[in-house]
Interface confidence: medium
Amino acid sequence: MSYIPGQPVTAVVQRVEIHKLRQGENLILGFSIGGGIDQDPSQNPFSEDKTDKGIYVTRVSEGGPAEIAGLQIGDKIMQVNGWDMTMVTHDQARKRLTKRSEEVVRLLVTRQSLQKAVQQSMLS
């Protein structure tokens, strides 16, 4: 899709369902996170607002459960299985994502639309 100047830029909200992969004793999600209210938001390359202390996806393993489910680098995680993730520490976020009792993780994420990504790539 090519970017048309003047085209509205929107953020979309999607639910991403990740079915954890069992590897021995471990349940694998296949992605990494950054951010949290205890972290320095200015170091977050994905947020436009440099005071944003949200949780962001920083890495997605190729062929892993998260990639298969449609999670993308730069996604902001708003909820994990119904739990609010907008005001949590990095460690709280990690613990909510890796609860051993939950084999399915339902994330609510916001992401910049394709138009915006294309727009930014043209500007860079």
Partner: antibody, heavy 123, light 112 residues
Framework: QVQLQQSGAELARPGASVKLSCKAS????????ISWVIQKTGQGLEWIGE????????YYNEKFKAKAALTADKSSSTAHMELRSLTSEDSAVYFC????????????????WGQGTPLTVSS | DVLMTQTPLSLPVSLGDQASISCRSS???????????LEWYLQKPGQSPKLLIH???NRFSGVPDRFSGSGSGTDFTLKISRVEAEDLGVYYC?????????FGGGTKLEIK
Amino acid sequence: QVQLQQSGAELARPGASVKLSCKASGYTFTSSGISWVIQKTGQGLEWIGEIYPRSGNTYYNEKFKAKAALTADKSSSTAHMELRSLTSEDSAVYFCARSKTYYSKYGGFFDYWGQGTPLTVSS
Amino acid sequence: DVLMTQTPLSLPVSLGDQASISCRSSQSIVHGNGNTYLEWYLQKPGQSPKLLIHKVSNRFSGVPDRFSGSGSGTDFTLKISRVEAEDLGVYYCFQGSHVPPTFGGGTKLEIK
């Protein structure tokens, strides 16, 4: 066969609360979600929210977050929706529907529906 | 929220004719996992809605093959090749790709 049996018509006073129920049969209750959908007279359909009975996790349309509370009783395979602080605007038919996940290869989001519960709010 | 716009509002047809209903979303409804969660439901008078089509073009079990769905991105169509009396009612399109999931306003299929 899959069936969702909803509770009967309700008449409630403004300001009151009401609890609607949806009893599931014909499938494993904890294997899918239960969604609730509102339809005002002569109007279209609007998703209120859903609950996954196995975990109790709930998801709401922001518009209905203050209005509806979803619960599920695994022992009786019944989902409930409590509607609070009722006004005449809440008068509608409320449907429950089995909601499937993105990973379901068969069927859509709402593959089976209850018959609907009419709610009238009037003083 | 994603706005789903259906046209026409009302569709008068003769039995045996082909009917076509259009549904347009306010933004692309391709999910991050590559699927397009566009569905069609039929609500007959006095009944609850019934699933007809899921993921744009897949017929739900028991749905006759005279019903077909097509489209991509933001534009979708439901076609009924030969309308029968039992097909009358209100048709709704629905998107489940974005949160909250949303329905179209409905198209009433009626006898001409």
